[in-house]
């Protein structure tokens, strides 16, 4: 069992039972809205305490508190007194016997001055309307199944009434610098919760309610940067609730209180429980955690190794429910693999693997132990094995049909999921560092590509699953395919020569025109060459905006790869052909549903790799080769 699991147990707090004989100043303040001079409250609806204050001191035995249920003889309630500094005396009666506390029938109470034989004050109440519940007695707090989630469960001092109470949770970061103040949330019973103490009569909504979809193990959700008051979603039922939207890796304190529901039972909010503290595990995204399977049986997880620290992976399987059946999951060791350090620029990666099941949600935890022995836990987002299928690297084949005109073909790495496989093809001119990326339609098996003649290129292909059945991260790029486009034929050269002669003549003529007749020259220039927009200025903001939508991610791969390329999609030229859906358009639609997307791991960037910040240079290929993609070959 990892040491992280211990914090689930250590943050459990057992509260001491309240001393019911005394009335605290807190009780008095909680009943401040009760205008009756004789105030009464019940902690469990099986007890009753009544009290009133007298300004003037009176001899012992002056007052008597009498009570009677309908048609019964009045009885006296034994009184105790508390001296009130700067005020006088508080008289308190705790009903001596549970038999004397009856719900749902009017209880007549009156205070009598025995010496004067006068009724000082009187009241009729229903014990079921004067609840002042004691706070939940046992509070357990632990991390939920997603980063930033907190699972809280509690026990009621009086379990038989817990169905008729509503709860409020107050919490905040333990470090006050991180917050503007505590957050208070009413715990609303909903169907997406995890009941910790489910009673037999309450119908479980877990099986019929839609559970939140597990997110993809290779995708990073939006990072929470604001350290101030977190917006959080919360679900509750019975003795349990789940808060989400907290800052992973932070420490929180929390308190609970309860109030009669106002439907079956009435009363006031009770006091807050003593604070419980809990440390949330960090988000494994920070470690660049990526998990995948190649065979739908074994799962491999990898993450960046921290300097001067050791790390260990853990996993557990939970059934396809909103919440794990077991409140305290048993984390199993993920079998460690050899550490890899393929390149100097790449951080060292830790890898581990384990056998998985296809009928369960997979939960991953990474524990990092620093040199002083401090253990930091990082939680991955849960996923199904079929959402983490990594394809083998595809093979790319090409042949040149005519000068600069390439016919490309590739084999589907997985024939069983051909229609769910999407590809990315990237190419770059020799000597250039930046890549142009093309996305064929989903399921395409090839296509044609027009490149500049007499040029050298490198082409690479990668694949990923993005269908209704299977999804997963990108495969690694195929080995670079080197292409040298052919020289044009003689007659093309002749045409080129003619073009050159005519071109030179035109340039000379224009220069003469510009020198002799400048106004005519400007008109002619505008007619022949309308001003073209600066593509980088035009596209720059689009690229920056899109980049903001897809935050950069620490991508983990087998080999030291180039920085992720800029995404530039080139559509088929012919308008009569209806192109098949592209991976990226599919992806943008799916992204909102937390489904994997082909854009998921591709940060958009206008800078080539290794460019210094603020020194973005132009993309050479984008400047030279806006050539059409003739067609994509369908299966």
């Amino acid at each position: 069992m990892p040491s992280w699991a211990l914090f689930m147990v250590t943050s459990c707090l057992l509260l001491a039972p309240q001393n019911l004989a005394q009335v605290s100043s807190q009780d008095v303040s909680l009943l401040a809205s009760d205008s009756e001079p004789l105030k009464c409250f019940s902690r469990t609806f099986e007890d009753l305490t009544c009290f009133w204050d007298e300004e003037e001191a009176a001899p012992s035995g002056t007052y008597q508190l009498l009570y009677a249920y309908p048609r019964e003889k009045p009885r006296a309630c034994p009184l105790s007194s508390q001296s009130m500094p700067h005020f006088g005396t508080r008289y308190v009666c705790q009903f001596p016997d549970q038999e004397e506390v009856r719900l749902f029938f009017p209880l007549h109470l009156w205070v009598k001055n025995v010496f004067l034989n006068q009724t000082r004050t009187q009241r009729v109440l229903f014990v079921d309307s004067v609840g002042l519940p004691a706070p939940p007695s046992i509070i357990k707090a632990m991390g939920g199944s997603q980063p930033g989630e907190l699972q809280i469960s509690w026990e009621e001092p009086a379990p038989e009434i817990s169905d008729f109470l509503r709860y409020e949770l107050r919490y905040g970061p333990r470090d006050p610098k991180n917050s503007t103040g505590p957050t208070v949330i009413q715990l609303i019973a909903t169907e997406t919760c995890c009941p910790a103490l489910q009673r037999p009569h309450s119908a479980s909504a877990l099986d019929q309610s839609p559970c939140a979809q597990p997110t993809m193990p290779w995708q990073d959700g939006p990072k929470q940067t604001s350290p101030s008051r977190e917006a959080s979603a919360l679900t509750a039922e019975g003795g349990s609730c789940l808060i989400s939207g907290l800052q992973p890796g932070n420490s929180y304190w929390l308190q609970l209180r309860s109030e009669p529901d106002g439907i079956s039972l009435g009363g006031s909010w009770g006091s807050w429980s003593l604070p419980v503290t809990v440390d949330l595990p960090g988000d494994a995204v920070a470690l660049g955690l990526q998990c995948f399977t190649l065979d739908l049986k074994n799962v491999t997880c990898q993450w960046q190794q921290q300097d001067h620290a050791s790390s260990q992976g853990f996993f557990y399987h939970s059934r396809a429910r909103c919440c794990p059946r077991d409140r305290y999951p048993i984390w199993e060791n993920c079998e460690e693999e050899e550490k890899t350090n393929p390149g100097l620029q790449t951080p060292q990666f830790s890898r581990c693997h384990f056998k998985s099941r296809n009928d369960s949600i997979i939960h991953i935890l990474v524990e990092v132990t620093t040199a002083p022995g401090t253990v930091h836990s990082y939680l991955g987002s849960p996923f199904w094995i079929h959402q983490a299928v990594r394809l083998p690297t595809p093979n790319l084949h090409w042949r040149e049909i005519s000068s600069g005109h390439l016919e490309l073909e590739w084999q589907h790495p997985s024939s069983w999921a051909a229609q769910e496989t999407c590809y990315q093809l990237r190419y770059t001119g020799e000597g250039h560092q930046d890549w142009k990326v093309l996305e064929p339609p989903l399921g395409a098996r090839g296509g044609t590509l027009e490149l500049r003649p007499r040029s050298r290129y490198r082409l690479q292909l990668r694949a990923r699953l993005n269908g209704p059945t299977y999804q997963g991260p990108w495969s690694s790029w195929s080995d670079p395919t080197r292409v040298e486009t052919a020289t044009e034929t003689a007659w093309i050269s002749l045409v080129t020569a003619l073009h050159l002669v005519l071109g030179l003549s035109a340039v000379l003529g224009l220069l003469l025109l510009r020198w002799q007749f400048p106004a005519h020259y400007r008109r002619l220039r505008h007619a022949l060459w309308p001003s073209l927009p600066d593509l980088h200025r035009v596209l720059g903001q689009y690229l920056r905006d899109t980049a903001a939508l897809s935050p950069p991610k620490a991508t983990v791969s087998d080999t030291c790869e180039e920085v992720e390329p800029s995404l530039l999609e080139i559509l088929p030229k012919s308008s009569e052909r209806t192109p098949l859906p592209l991976c990226s358009s599919q992806a943008q639609m799916d992204y909102r549903r937390l489904q994997p997307s082909c854009l998921g791991t591709m940060p958009l960037s206008v800078c080539p790799p290794m460019a210094e910040s603020g020194s973005c240079c132009t993309t050479h290929i984008a400047n030279h080769s806006y050539l059409p993609l003739s067609y994509w070959q369908q299966p």
Epitope: R102, L103, F105, V124, D128, S129, E160, D163
Partner: antibody, heavy 117, light 107 residues
Framework: QVQLVQSGGGLVRPGGSLSLSCAVS????????MHWVRQAPGKGLEWVAG????????YYADSVQGRFTISRDSSKNTLYLQMNSLRAEDTAVYYC??????????WGQGTMVTVSS | DIQMTQSPSTLSASIGDRVTITCRAS??????LAWYQQKPGKAPKLLIY???SLASGAPSRFSGSGSGTDFTLTISSLQPDDFATYYC?????????FGGGTKLEIK
């Protein structure tokens, strides 16, 4: 959802007896007040009897004291009204109802009792 | 026994009218008073409890006020569904007693 389903009732001769039942479902609280209320044809509502569901307290209207008995069976979650020595003025629709600090919030569908020779 | 006197016994009003029904207890009952609505052949339905608290499921156009001995039920804007008989009931002491009822009719 709390439900009160009534049964019994019917035609009975003066001096005769009849038992009414009220099956309670959906209430899980340890104890709660249950009552019988009646309404003579064309008249107003009249409270008849009440009992705490732990059986410790029973209350009756003066008009039925000594003739009617309210009881409950916790194992069956059922409320009863045993009516003896019935009179013509007992003819009414009888309702069972749950009562507490909020009055009678849940009512049965009613059952007709006719006392006639 | 505590007597509950309701007035008027019959009330004619039009849709959209503001309507008030009063109930007086023969002795002080604090705020332990409920109002019910009953339609022919149906069981009564709780509208107001503890003199002024709106019962679950009751429309917000219904409101109650009063304490001690004098109480009122107000319907802010009469709707077609509101034509029925209304009863007040004290539950401060036993025997529990109802008012004689107010029949609300269409004018």
């Amino acid at each position: 959802q709390v439900q009160l389903v009534q049964s019994g009732g019917g035609l009975v001769r003066p001096g005769g007896s009849l038992s009414l039942s009220c099956a309670v479902s959906g209430i899980t609280l340890r104890t709660y007040g249950m009552h019988w209320v009646r309404q003579a044809p064309g008249k107003g509502l009249e409270w008849v009897a009440g009992i705490s569901f732990d059986g410790r307290s029973e209350y009756y209207a003066d008009s039925v004291q000594g003739r009617f008995t309210i009881s409950r069976d916790s194992s069956k979650n059922t409320l009863y009204l045993q009516m003896n020595s019935l009179r013509a003025e007992d003819t009414a629709v009888y309702y069972c109802a749950r009562g507490a600090h909020y009055g009678f919030d849940i009512w049965g569908q009613g059952t007709m009792v006719t006392v006639s020779s | 026994d505590i007597q509950m006197t309701q007035s008027p016994s019959t009330l004619s009003a039009s849709i959209g009218d503001r309507v008030t029904i009063t109930c007086r207890a023969s002795e002080g009952i604090y705020h332990w008073l409920a109002w019910y609505q009953q339609k022919p052949g149906k069981a009564p339905k709780l509208l107001i409890y503890k003199a002024s608290s709106l019962a679950s499921g009751a429309p917000s156009r219904f409101s109650g006020s009063g304490s001690g001995t004098d109480f009122t039920l107000t319907i802010s804007s009469l709707q077609p569904d509101d034509f029925a008989t209304y009863y007040c009931q004290q539950y401060s002491n036993y025997p529990l007693t109802f008012g004689g009822g107010t029949k609300l009719e269409i004018k």
